[in-house]
């Protein structure tokens, strides 16, 4: 003998977040008379999604006109789907009863899976700057995606990195997931213009991965190299000494001239020149009045770069009746080369 069956033809339905899910249900008979209800989950804790007879379900619309007695279609549409809507939905036929309707037949259930796009990856670098040859860590985070399968890659200037660790949380079933990855990057002096990119690929992105970037200019500190040279005589009693500060980054730099250990002048780097690799060069000069000195003069160019301990380079200026043009940077003339001065 024929008996009403509740047919849910779709074992599973996959819907993108924000879209509408259609959950199909057909009763194979118009009798017994009684309403249809939709539930998420089974058993005593099941959640009522739609009741044909009563209630207000603002996100749910029926595909067919359920007020018509000859209708066998009890499909519903759920609007504005979010990952929290994931679960198994059951279409349940009730038989008219007194005082309450009695559950008669349930469909096999339709599993609703929600595809949610990952958020834009956020890449963050170390809190403090680091110098070339040091290894620094970058983290990349993306949230709110579903299903769990996701691919994360790291790149530095288009070259894929291999030294990274990635976790997807939670480990078990969830409505949505997060990914966290940490990559290790070795800095080089040429990295001012470099970028670290975190690339996330997910089924919802249709082959167009999301990228998060971090500029190594925010991370790297390239310490300057100093060179002090004595220029040809400008006048009988004056010598021009220059301090060339090369290949530094970032620009924040303060230079102090010392004559025999005494501060002569302090200045801040302003009109710098930029190198192709993004580092800066700067030059400062000191006009020394030789006639004011009886003895030899030790000139020191002391540089404090980006709040780091000062580095310095010295130059010995020989005082004689006729100051000759001196060679630059010879060992004899540059005592205390790169020595740390504490004044």
């Amino acid at each position: 003998e024929e008996e009403l069956q509740v047919i849910q033809p779709d074992k599973s339905v996959l819907v993108a977040a924000g879209e509408t899910a259609t959950l199909r249900c057909t009763a194979t008979s118009l009798i017994p008379v009684g309403p249809i209800q939709w539930f998420r989950g089974a058993g005593p804790g099941r959640e009522l999604i739609y009741n044909q007879k009563e209630g207000h379900f603002p996100r749910v619309t029926t595909v067919s006109d359920l007020t018509k007695r000859n209708n066998m279609d009890f499909s519903i549409r759920i609007g504005n789907i979010t990952p929290a809507d994931a679960g198994t939905y059951y279409c349940v036929k009730f038989r008219k009863g007194s005082p309450d309707d009695v559950e008669f037949k349930s469909g096999a259930g339709t599993e609703l899976s929600v595809r949610a796009k990952p958020s834009a990856p956020v890449v963050s670098g170390p809190a403090a700057r680091a110098t070339p040859q040091h290894t620094v860590s970058f983290t990349c985070e993306s949230h709110g995606f579903s299903p769990r399968d996701i691919t994360l890659k790291w790149f530095k200037n288009g070259n894929e990195l291999s030294d990274f660790q990635t976790n997807v949380d939670p480990v078990g079933e969830s409505v949505s997931y997060s990914i966290h990855s940490t990559a290790k990057v070795v800095l080089t002096r040429e990295d001012v213009h470099s970028q670290v990119i975190c690339e996330v690929a997910h089924v919802t992105l249709q082959g167009d991965p999301l990228r998060g970037t971090a500029n190594l200019s925010e991370t790297i500190r390239v310490p300057p190299t100093l060179e002090v040279t004595q220029q040809p005589v400008r006048a009988e009693n004056q010598v021009n000494v220059t301090c060339q500060v090369r290949k530094f980054y970032p620009q924040r730099l303060q230079l102090t001239w010392l004559e025999n250990g005494n501060v002569s002048r302090t200045e801040t780097a302003s009109t710098v020149t930029e190198n192709k690799d993004g580092t800066y060069n700067w030059m400062s000069w000191l006009l020394v009045n030789v006639s004011a000195h009886r003895d030899d003069v030790k000139l020191t160019c002391q540089v404090e770069h980006d709040g780091q301990p000062a580095v310095s380079k010295s130059h010995d200026l020989k005082v004689s009746a006729h100051p000759k043009e001196q060679g630059s940077n010879t060992a004899a003339e540059n005592t205390g080369s790169n020595e740390r001065n504490i004044y």
Partner: antibody, heavy 122, light 107 residues
Framework: QVQLVESGGGVVQPGRSLRLSCAAS????????MAWVRQAPGKGLEWVAQ????????YYADSVKGRFTISRDNSKNTLYLQMNSLRAEDTAVYYC???????????????WGQGTMVTVSS | DIQMTQSPSSLSASVGDRVTITCQAS??????LNWYQQKPGKAPKLLIY???NLETGVPSRFSGSGSGTDFTFTISSLQPEDIATYYC?????????FGGGTKVEIK
């Protein structure tokens, strides 16, 4: 006036395919479920397939399941029946019919086309 | 599937006669039953729906009754234009099924 006109019938060899069309006019096609019903020569009526008003669900007789596909294009007010792997027993006049009630899955048919003959023969 | 048994399979009556056709369902189908008329070479036409409701534009000499498993279709006064085959159809259960038809002729 309300009208359904079938086309696409003809003689076809067993195992081959055929597509029937049904052009609707005189009513809001997109509000009604539509069906195909066939009648073998000298025989009674047999329901073949049905589709919801919006095309979101389809229903088939066991005898055609997996071989026939019902579809509709509401923008063209047209119903289709794609018939594959045809057999001699599919020989019949094919009628398209309108469901009696709007926006439902019911199986009472108030408007019928004139029919199109499909002959499956080698 | 629900079996629909129509009787008689054919009948011959005079103009003005009362004609009765019966339709029996293999199980309870409530009142979800239609009656159709099909004239030779033409498409079926809905006459009665839900066992007893007359379709718009159908002459009142046609009527239907019954519920459960037993149904009756009546032409109160047979007219020459009523020569046709009449089919019952249940739509309580999927798939919808038709009776074998009753061919009505004029004596």
């Amino acid at each position: 006036q309300v009208q359904l006109v079938e086309s696409g019938g003809g003689v076809v060899q067993p195992g081959r395919s055929l597509r029937l069309s049904c052009a609707a006019s005189g009513f809001t096609f997109s509000s009604y479920g539509m069906a195909w019903v066939r009648q073998a020569p000298g025989k009674g009526l047999e329901w073949v397939a049905q589709i919801l008003y919006d095309g979101s669900n389809e229903y088939y007789a066991d005898s055609v399941k997996g071989r026939f596909t019902i579809s509709r294009d509401n923008s063209k007010n047209t119903l289709y029946l794609q018939m594959n792997s045809l057999r001699a027993e599919d020989t019949a006049v094919y009628y398209c019919a309108r469901d009696l009630t709007k926006y439902t899955l019911g199986f009472a048919f108030d408007i019928w086309g004139q029919g199109t003959m499909v002959t499956v023969s080698s | 599937d629900i079996q629909m048994t129509q009787s008689p399979s054919s009948l011959s009556a005079s103009v003005g006669d009362r004609v009765t056709i019966t339709c029996q369902a293999s199980q309870d189908i409530s009142n979800y039953l239609n009656w159709y008329q099909q004239k030779p070479g033409k498409a079926p036409k809905l006459l009665i729906y839900d066992a007893s409701n007359l379709e718009t534009g159908v002459p009142s000499r046609f009527s239907g009754s019954g519920s459960g498993t037993d149904f009756t279709f009546t032409i109160s006064s047979l007219q020459p234009e009523d020569i046709a085959t009449y089919y019952c159809q249940q739509f309580t259960y999927l798939p919808p099924t038709f009776g074998g038809g009753t061919k009505v002729e004029i004596k």
